[in-house]
Amino acid sequence: YFGKLESKLSVIRNLNDQVLFIDQGNRPLFEDMTDSDCRDNAPRTIFIISMYKDSQPRGMAVTISVKCEKISTLSCENKIISFKEMNPPDNIKDTKSDIIFFQRSVPGHDNKMQFESSSYEGYFLACEKERDLFKLILKKEDELGDRSIMFTVQNED
């Protein structure tokens, strides 16, 4: 069971300081942006991180949403990352969900975060280059100290 608590507005960056945004095709991508670029591209660069209480606590449970015309929420259904047109629900009556991630602070690096899927233990949000695009994907942590699964989260509230 997950029960919704508060939400905050955040900018998410990878460790190369590229900003996460949602493009016109609803794809989550990373791109180099100045602070003014980041502001100019809002609300596509502003993510709503909603915290949830967890009946079986395994870390800070969150959903990641974005509000452009409508609210879309990040999902990792079948280990494929996509934004689904939906509001983060008030309650989820299950111990796993494709839209719930555990936001983890990396020990020794308080400002570096990882997002582990609640549906697929050991799978994390990651940034991966594919041709000329830097995409948000779900990947199994396969090497120690993998920088691709680490992010910074800057609160905009």
Partner: antibody, heavy 119, light 110 residues
Framework: EVQLVQSGAEVKKPGSSVKVSCKAS????????ISWVRQAPGQGLEWMGN????????YYAQKFQGRVTITADESTSTAYMELSSLRSEDTAVYYC????????????WGQGTLVTVSS | DIVLTQPPSVSGAPGQRVTISCSGS????????VNWYQQLPGTAPKLLIY???HRPSGVPDRFSGSKSGTSASLAITGLQSEDEADYYC???????????FGGGTKLTVL
Amino acid sequence: EVQLVQSGAEVKKPGSSVKVSCKASGGTFNSYAISWVRQAPGQGLEWMGNIIPYSGFAYYAQKFQGRVTITADESTSTAYMELSSLRSEDTAVYYCARAAYHPLVFDNWGQGTLVTVSS
Amino acid sequence: DIVLTQPPSVSGAPGQRVTISCSGSSSNIGNHYVNWYQQLPGTAPKLLIYRNNHRPSGVPDRFSGSKSGTSASLAITGLQSEDEADYYCQSWDYSGFSTVFGGGTKLTVL
């Protein structure tokens, strides 16, 4: 750099209660869990329970259920552990520990508070 | 009361490699992650290894963790005098949301 600073040593009589505090500085207090772990003289570590300030949930080890109360005050970034019905076997160093990665991965520890229970 | 079993003591000469074992069961190590803590004399414990084999920043790569089945181990290579401490393994049980520690192993550097 996160720091956890605990209250000072206590001497208590059997049957009484003790309340130990743990003040956090640095980091975001309500985005991680605070556990309490004790260590009797010359013995190992024993988890007592924790609180997750952002959800308000507290969890207790079965052994301490009904005798321990863990609370948190977000306005002062302070967690508290109260243990009642004290007995001599409760003489120990009590540690608070922060868990920012997982509620049971203790990545920062307080300096410890010695609680002595003696008549 | 102690669910995870560790040897009470291990020793090694400077520069040597030592391992500390931690034995559990399917209800803890078999199905969950293992963490290791180092406790230097008179100080609070410190996180050494988390999630079986991850090192927090600042922990030398001389320390490594591994897990197989219902057992875990901590290896320390290039032993140094400052490694003399007590080492504790820890695992947890999601369903009961509780955690268990090993009894601790005292490492002596000869």
